[in-house]
Interface confidence: low
Amino acid sequence: EEVILLDSKASQAELGWTALPSNGWEEISGVDEHDRPIRTYQVCNVLEPNQDNWLQTGWISRGRGQRIFVELQFTLRDCSSIPGAAGTCKETFNVYYLETEADLGRGRPRLGGSRPRKIDTIAADESFTQGDLGERKMKLNTEVREIGPLSRRGFHLAFQDVGACVALVSVRVYYKQCRATVRGLATFPATAAESAFSTLVEVAGTCVAHSEGEPGSPPRMHCGADGEWLVPVGRCSCSAGFQERGDFCEACPPGFYKVSPRRPLCSPCPEHSRALENASTFCVCQDSYARSPTDPPSASCTRPPSAPRDLQYSLSRSPLVLRLRWLPPADSGGRSDVTYSLLCLRCGREGPAGACEPCGPRVAFLPRQAGLRERAATLLHLRPGARYTVRVAALNGVSGPAAAAGTTYAQVTVSTGPGAPWEEDEIRRDRVEPQSVSLSWREPIPAGAPGANDTEYEIRYYEKGQSEQTYSMVKTGAPTVTVTNLKPATRYVFQIRAASPGPSWEAQSFNPSIEVQTLGEAASGSRDQSPA
């Protein structure tokens, strides 16, 4: 586009330019080719020699222009059509400009500290004759000249007549600029064009509100000499929380989000999340839902799983092994990373479940206690004659650190026998004498396993029919005992319990009870007995 600095045709009032001498250039009202009223300057002192008539415009601010165009529309009379003017008539005039920081006023054109610079000598492509004048065939010439680059704030134009018959119909002064625009979400300011012979003017754009430059490509455009924008380079992208809408970035509406400038559009909130505000850069998980630290913002919110289903167990007593298996939770929480974790509690045989304590490091878990993907586990090294509660918790990527102790678990409570890890027929009556009995039993923990050597056994016995309170007791570290000083031909009740030494000993029960009758004095020899 053209930025007009001066247009003489636009003035309805007198132009009031400075003419020296006073009998030279003269301001005259006229009409243009469309019969619109205009102000013109004319001079026609063609019969007098040595003409030097000057016309100086008012001060013209150059604005942002450095290369300025001067468009002159004028008529010029053909000297040959003027009788008696052959020696003095000229068919050209000169145009000058004078750069200044401020208006020179109406003084002589040469004043002001710097000399006028000549733009050009202007000749007519077409001049008119007396005959044309009579027929009103004024032949309008248009000439455009470029001046600059200018450095001061403004300038005056000056026209020198040296003896022509000329009428200045229009003086138009302008510079070309590329108009302010928005391209690729970047605003580019109105930019004055350089000369047609200069390089393009590179202009950096400014990203529109809520946008930012693309990686490595700050937005740029080039203003061409004709005032047209050329060669866009790079663009802006709407910031996180905003998306492109024509030439601007609009906030993501509630329910939508945009996490990065690299994503072009807002996305609907993933499942189980919401964005209540405009311009959300992420969506907040709904109550009881969460994302794991490794989930991207585009991931659906998920929740911890429900408890494992159908927890079943089997207890084998030789050796003492608890096997568990279960089914996946009914609700995985929307995630595929479900794992299982086991918690083992050893509880008192009676009373509330709260009287429990962790099983401790002695109990072994196969394949492991936590992070199981399998849906089965085995517990080893359980103590005989104890009651165990085992909880199996389902966990996933959004289960908190305390989730295993939370409520999403299934549990079973198991007693490791009716008081001991032996059935009645697992205790051997190895030797029965009139005054002694030898008993043996299998070890509750396999030989060689951790904890096997720590087991102690306590044997309690009393005469059948007597009060249990009148018992006698022996201890042994091996799974065998010989009790002596018994009465012949008497029925005794024997009870065995096993435990590792320590305060938990008292919690173990004496079970089962087996009865053995010593031999009478008359009995011959000793005899081995198979398990009865």
């Epitope: 809520h210 930012e212 430059g213 693309e214 990686p215 490595g216 490509s217 700050p218 910031s239 996180a240 929380g241 990065s260 400038p261 690299r262 850069t281 991207p296």
Partner: antibody, heavy 112, light 106 residues
Framework: QVQLQQSGAELMKPGASVKISCKAT????????IEWVKQRPGHGLEWIGE????????NYKEKFKDKATFTANTSSTTAYMQLSSLTSEDSAVYYC?????WGQGTTLTVSS | QIVLTQSPAIMSASPGEKVTITCSAS?????MYWFQQKPGTSPKLWIY???NLASGVPARFSGSGSGTSYSLTISRMEAEDAATYYC?????????FGGGTKLEIK
């Protein structure tokens, strides 16, 4: 889940070249920019540049344009950074990153 | 390129104390990102888009700021917060990091 596994430590001689790899899993490899960051003790973190694997498009920080070259193999979902004409100034830990997921870092030592 | 200046470069704080780390940009940026790095590990995104906590970051952390001035604040310092914190801008390319603030526990 997103994981970036980088190649192991390298000991190189001055003037040599080295190629560091970054194996990406857990996301759509071709559509995310992979960035490379340099960390020297006492010098903090410095962005080297980035590559968009799907198109091969790259952006380099000016000072690394003649030092680093990024490539990517979409079939193996692996990004590479080659560093050439090595000097002691190139001794550093180099990280690959995508959005806010970072690799574990590759230590490069340049010594004669 | 935009230069990010962090202050202080090193500081120590007692448990329970309030901590503020600042990051000043040489030109205006839209958002600031903060990373935490502990010795021998990769940087971890800590705060993104100026004020949003990354997943798993304790609520005692917060971020704020606009234009050329940003900050990371810990309302009550804990031992696990001892680390080096870096700010990063991605508004203008190339992305740049601050020089880091080493936060120690007294």
């Amino acid at each position: 889940q997103v994981q970036l596994q980088q190649s192991g430590a390298e000991l190189m001689k001055p003037g040599a070249s080295v190629k560091i790899s970054c194996k990406a899993t857990g996301y759509t490899f071709s559509t995310y920019w992979i960035e490379w960051v340099k960390q020297r003790p006492g010098h903090g973190l410095e962005w080297i540049g980035e590559i968009l694997p799907g198109s091969g498009r790259t952006n380099y920080k000016e000072k690394f344009k003649d030092k680093a070259t990024f490539t990517a193999n979409t079939s193996s979902t692996t990004a590479y950074m080659q560093l050439s004409s090595l000097t002691s100034e190139d001794s550093a830990v180099y990280y690959c990153a995508i959005d806010w997921y970072w690799g574990q870092g590759t230590t490069l030592t340049v010594s004669s | 390129q935009i230069v990010l200046t962090q202050s202080p470069a090193i500081m120590s704080a007692s448990p329970g104390e309030k901590v503020t780390i600042t990051c000043s940009a040489s030109s205006s940026v839209s958002y600031m990102y903060w990373f935490q790095q502990k010795p021998g590990t990769s940087p971890k995104l800590w705060i993104y888009s100026t004020s949003n906590l990354a997943s798993g970051v304790p609520a005692r952390f917060s971020g704020s700021g606009s234009g050329t001035s940003y900050s990371l604040t810990i309302s009550r310092m804990e031992a696990e917060d001892a680390a080096t914190y870096y700010c990063q801008q991605r508004n203008s390319y190339p992305p740049t990091f601050g020089g880091g603030t080493k936060l120690e526990i007294k």
